[in-house]
């Protein structure tokens, strides 16, 4: 039950990539507005996105306080222009979100190959260490800072003239691979958190190939 003409939010969904975290829901409001509250399992509710006509709310600032905590959000529905009005039970209609643990569930963003350098038959490939919105001592942490050795990168590399993708793995942001002399190679990387059971992989980075600007070649 609830106030006449007010409908409860539904399909509450967390959308999160590299800890940038937005709660989305339905329906688009007709003569109603929403307010979101978020809390840890043991904490107090904090209100966000007051009386909004949006169907999303950016909760990044809250979840980055402790990305290993489990969060719950709820979306309250109020009649437009009468936000003090409550339902028949004495409080506004609301719907709970699924629980969300950022460290375990945030999607890994698409990585970027920062550079590659060939020295003889070795190539060093470096992955950009992307900055997140997680803060410590007033500085933003990188993905590596947050995940540490839980985060690995898989490198796919192949001769420009062939289709078979060899792989290499690292728990740093650098690869050192063997290549055949005189051959051009292409590279793509994928971020992986093997200890997860879902959302383990990122999408692949854009492909970078030798003979393009990003790389450097040195004959030894």
């Amino acid at each position: 039950s609830g106030t006449t003409n007010t409908v409860a939010a539904y399909n509450l969904t967390w959308k999160s990539t590299n800890f940038k975290t937005i709660l989305e829901w339905e329906p688009k409001p007709v003569n109603q507005v929403y307010t979101v509250q978020i809390s840890t399992k043991s904490g107090d509710w904090k209100s966000k996105c007051f009386y909004t006509t949006d169907t999303e709310c950016d909760l990044t600032d809250e979840i980055v306080k402790d990305v290993k905590q489990t969060y719950l959000a709820r979306v309250f529905s109020y009649p437009a222009g009468n936000v003090e009005s409550t339902g028949s039970a004495g409080e506004p209609l609301y719907e709970n979100s699924p629980e969300f643990t950022p460290y375990l569930e945030t999607n890994l963003g698409q990585p970027t190959i920062q550079s590659f350098e060939q020295v003889g038959t070795k190539v060093n490939v470096t992955v950009e260490d992307e900055r997140t919105l997680v803060r410590r001592n007033n500085t933003f942490l990188s993905l590596r800072d947050v995940f540490g050795k839980d985060l690995i990168y898989t490198l796919y590399y192949w001769k420009s003239s062939s289709s078979g993708k060899k792989t290499a793995k690292t728990n740093t942001n650098e690869f050192l691979i063997d290549v055949d002399k005189g051959e051009n190679y292409c590279f793509s990387v994928q971020a992986v958190i093997p200890s997860r059971t879902v959302n383990r992989k990122s999408t692949d980075s854009p492909v970078e190939c030798m003979g393009q600007e990003k790389g450097e070649f040195r004959e030894i």
């Epitope: 796919y156 289709s163 793995k169 690292t170 059971t197 992989k201």
Partner: antibody, heavy 120, light 107 residues
Framework: EVQLVESGGGLVQPGGSLRLSCAAS????????IHWVRQAPGKGLEWVGY????????YYADSVKGRFTISADTSRNTAYLQMNSLRAEDTAVYYC?????????????WGQGTLVTVSS | DIQMTQSPSSLSASVGDRVTITCRAS??????VAWYQQKPGKAPKLLIY???FLYSGVPSRFSGSRSGTDFTLTISSLQPEDFATYYC?????????FGQGTKVEIK
């Protein structure tokens, strides 16, 4: 419970084709990598190839390159091994296995295998 | 491709014996070596990963070690259910490669 079940094996003539399936349950294949490994009667294990179902990337052993193709249907949570131009030396039990994908752990779960016999 | 040379190809032992199987990689593979146990008509089972770590549910009589490019699987006290074939595998580079296998038989 993680499970891999191979099917599609059987008797085929030299030069013929066969498609093996590897149906996965208890995990989502696009979050992992799937390998095919074979074992000729009385012989050791031979790696055939892998697929990353999330992007379709593959790599094959030299012995099967150009004849075998690995694919995946993520909606069915199933990987496939298409074998063409089969030879007597391809006779083996074919296993699919899940690659955990960490630096430390590779093939952590295997299917029960399916026998492929190439003979006239 | 990296070769994994496994020895011996077979051995006979009695229940309670200490058994050692070795694998030598043709080049550096760091610790990216696994050991598998296979019984007749069955799929291989992971025993040891990352050269020396015991996989979940595997009895503690199994252990693995590394010295450079040499890798060892040890069964401290052979049990009746341990009679099987054992394989090493490197997954440091593509393609991954297996050793030839060691058949552990009853003396």
């Amino acid at each position: 419970e993680v499970q891999l079940v191979e099917s599609g094996g059987g008797l085929v003539q030299p030069g013929g084709s066969l498609r093996l399936s590897c149906a996965a349950s208890g995990f989502t294949i696009s979050d992992y990598w799937i390998h095919w490994v074979r074992q000729a009667p009385g012989k050791g294990l031979e790696w055939v190839g892998y697929i990353d179902p999330s992007n379709g990337y593959t790599y094959y052993a030299d012995s099967v390159k150009g004849r075998f193709t690995i694919s995946a249907d993520t909606s069915r949570n199933t990987a496939y091994l298409q074998m063409n131009s089969l030879r007597a030396e391809d006779t083996a039990v074919y296993y699919c296995a899940r690659d955990y994908g960490s630096l430390e752990v590779s093939l952590d779960y295997w299917g029960q295998g399916t026998l492929v016999t190439v003979s006239s | 491709d990296i070769q994994m040379t496994q020895s011996p190809s077979s051995l006979s032992a009695s229940v309670g014996d200490r058994v050692t199987i070795t694998c030598r990689a043709s080049q550096d593979v760091n610790t990216a070596v696994a050991w598998y146990q296979q019984k007749p008509g069955k799929a291989p089972k992971l025993l040891i990963y990352s050269a020396s770590f015991l996989y979940s549910g595997v009895p503690s009589r199994f252990s693995g070690s590394r010295s450079g490019t040499d890798f060892t699987l040890t069964i401290s006290s052979l049990q009746p259910e341990d009679f099987a074939t054992y394989y090493c595998q490197q997954h440091y580079t593509t393609p991954p490669t297996f050793g030839q296998g060691t058949k552990v038989e009853i003396k």
